[in-house]
Amino acid sequence: EEELQVIQPDKSVSVAAGESAILHCTVTSLIPVGPIQWFRGAGPARELIYNQKEGHFPRVTTVSESTKRENMDFSISISNITPADAGTYYCVKFRKGSPDTEFKSGAGTELSVRAKPSAPVVSGPAARATPQHTVSFTCESHGFSPRDITLKWFKNGNELSDFQTNVDPVGESVSYSIHSTAKVVLTREDVHSQVICEVAHVTLQGDPLRGTANLSETIRVPPTLEVTQQPVRAENQVNVTCQVRKFYPQRLQLTWLENGNVSRTETASTVTENKDGTYNWMSWLLVNVSAHRDDVKLTCQVEHDGQPAVSKSHDLKVSAHPKEQGSNTAAENTGSNERNIYGGSG
């Protein structure tokens, strides 16, 4: 009679975390009499996973009725698989005796556990940056297995190439993490832009996970200022406007100065939004010319998003009849209340 063989037909089995793994094992003979044991690993450190004869193995069930006399199928199912269950499983036939002795081992089945990566989390810089600057975004995803994974970066659907990715740990682990840093150059049009991190893994069946970051949380577009003098509304009154254009975010404070003295401060409220997501705002000042003997220097000073103030000035001639004119000067920081000047915004 031919000697008993232990057949493990599957060289490898891959199972998703949380599922059950079926490990197949059959023997070719009923002789010699004796139990089957399943081990993870081989050699002196092997771990007993299931003993047909005795013991309590709550996660292991036999696929067929292994207690039947004629049974030759000793396949097992291991429930609720986790990445820690990965390894090579051996089905081992023992010869009955006191004690039972190992008779023959199967060739082993390598169990690999597939675990999905967590949703990628994208984070940007702590402080806002202005157009033309390069900023870094990081993307992290954890808990996946096996180690092979693909990560791509996009900005508004366009794939980025300037990034570095690491998968940790370098060696063996029950699960892995990925960390990537991408560099993005900001433009003035990026208020509505998105940076996307896309992770592809065997567990995702071709449907990658995505994490996004809105550049609106990263970008600061500084305003451009234009101060203009409107036609005379009344014989002694001049209307001067300060156009604050293309700024983001909305947080903005405007101060009018007359000859360097603060006349009025206001906060941007009823702004208009441009197509690119930036804002425009206008503030006006009604100046009573008759109250002034000399020329008046009007300055529109804007502090945007906590940044140093920028300003534009306008020289108002009081000796001659007012005409539309404008000029630029550097920022001024003095301030005292001035009468005979009225203002508004819109």
């Epitope: 690993g41 002196p44 450190a45 092997r46 390894g87 090579t88 051996y90 002795t101 190992e102 063996e172």
Partner: antibody, heavy 122, light 112 residues
């Protein structure tokens, strides 16, 4: 293919602790035993101990009280620490990979490091 | 501990001629699963040992077929059918059945 590289100090003072690390490159830690073996000058081979990928350790009883082998799977490294060394511990120390797939025993120490000479001297 | 005894201690050989080394264990290395847990290693001068034979008679990957292992239980033999110059070095047997793993004292093979 798999390569092993021992690293650590070449000179250790008597009564101090010998610490060696073996870095595994080009292969997996899983399913193997990771062994330390030494060879005193002009003598034969002596097995110190090994660690399985599941963390279980086995030591030579003659050295057990002084030896610890640990495994860092995340770095693909395993280490040897031997306390209270004497001149008798002067040897070439080898790290090696041991296969196991045929039951209770082992199936050959098939990959060896190039060895690192450790001298115990004051 | 299982004690391994090798003979001879030294073996002068002639290239092209056969050579044989004996290894005896203090207890049987034949396990109930039918495997004899005995390995043979060659340590060339100035090099690390290399695996030649495992499980008593299985040649390791890349080992020339002029090397063969035999034996069962407590008596084992390594044979080199035709010795070549590169075969010089010290040959060790090692039992791999139980810990502590133990080596024979070595057999030094040198060209006559």
């Amino acid at each position: 293919q798999v390569q092993l590289q021992e690293s650590g100090p070449g000179l250790v003072r008597p009564s101090e602790t010998l610490s060696l690390t073996c870095t595994v490159s080009g292969g997996s830690i899983r399913n193997y035993y990771w062994s330390w073996i030494r060879q005193p000058p002009g003598k034969g081979l002596e097995w110190i101990g090994f660690i399985y990928y599941n963390g279980r350790t086995f030591y030579n009883p003659s050295l057990k009280s002084r030896v610890t082998i640990s495994l860092d799977k995340s770095k693909n490294q395993f280490s040897l620490k031997m306390t209270s060394v004497t001149a008798a511990d002067t040897a070439v120390y080898y790290c090696a990979r041991v296969r196991a797939y045929s039951g209770i025993g082992l199936d050959g120490t098939d990959v060896w490091g190039q060895g690192t000479t450790v001298t115990v001297s004051s | 501990d299982i004690v391994m005894t090798q003979s001879p201690l030294s073996l002068p050989v002639t290239p092209g001629e056969p050579a044989s080394i004996s290894c005896k264990s203090s207890q049987s290395l034949l396990y109930s699963n039918g495997y004899a847990y005995l390995d043979w290693y060659l340590q060339r001068p100035g090099q690390s040992p290399q695996l030649l034979i495992y499980l008593g008679s299985n040649r390791a990957s890349g080992v020339p077929d002029r090397f063969s292992g035999s034996g069962s239980g407590t008596d084992f033999t390594l044979k080199i059918s035709r010795v070549e110059a590169e075969d010089v070095g010290v040959y060790y047997c090692m039992q791999a059945l139980q810990t502590p793993l133990t080596f024979g004292g070595g057999t030094k093979v040198e060209i006559k």
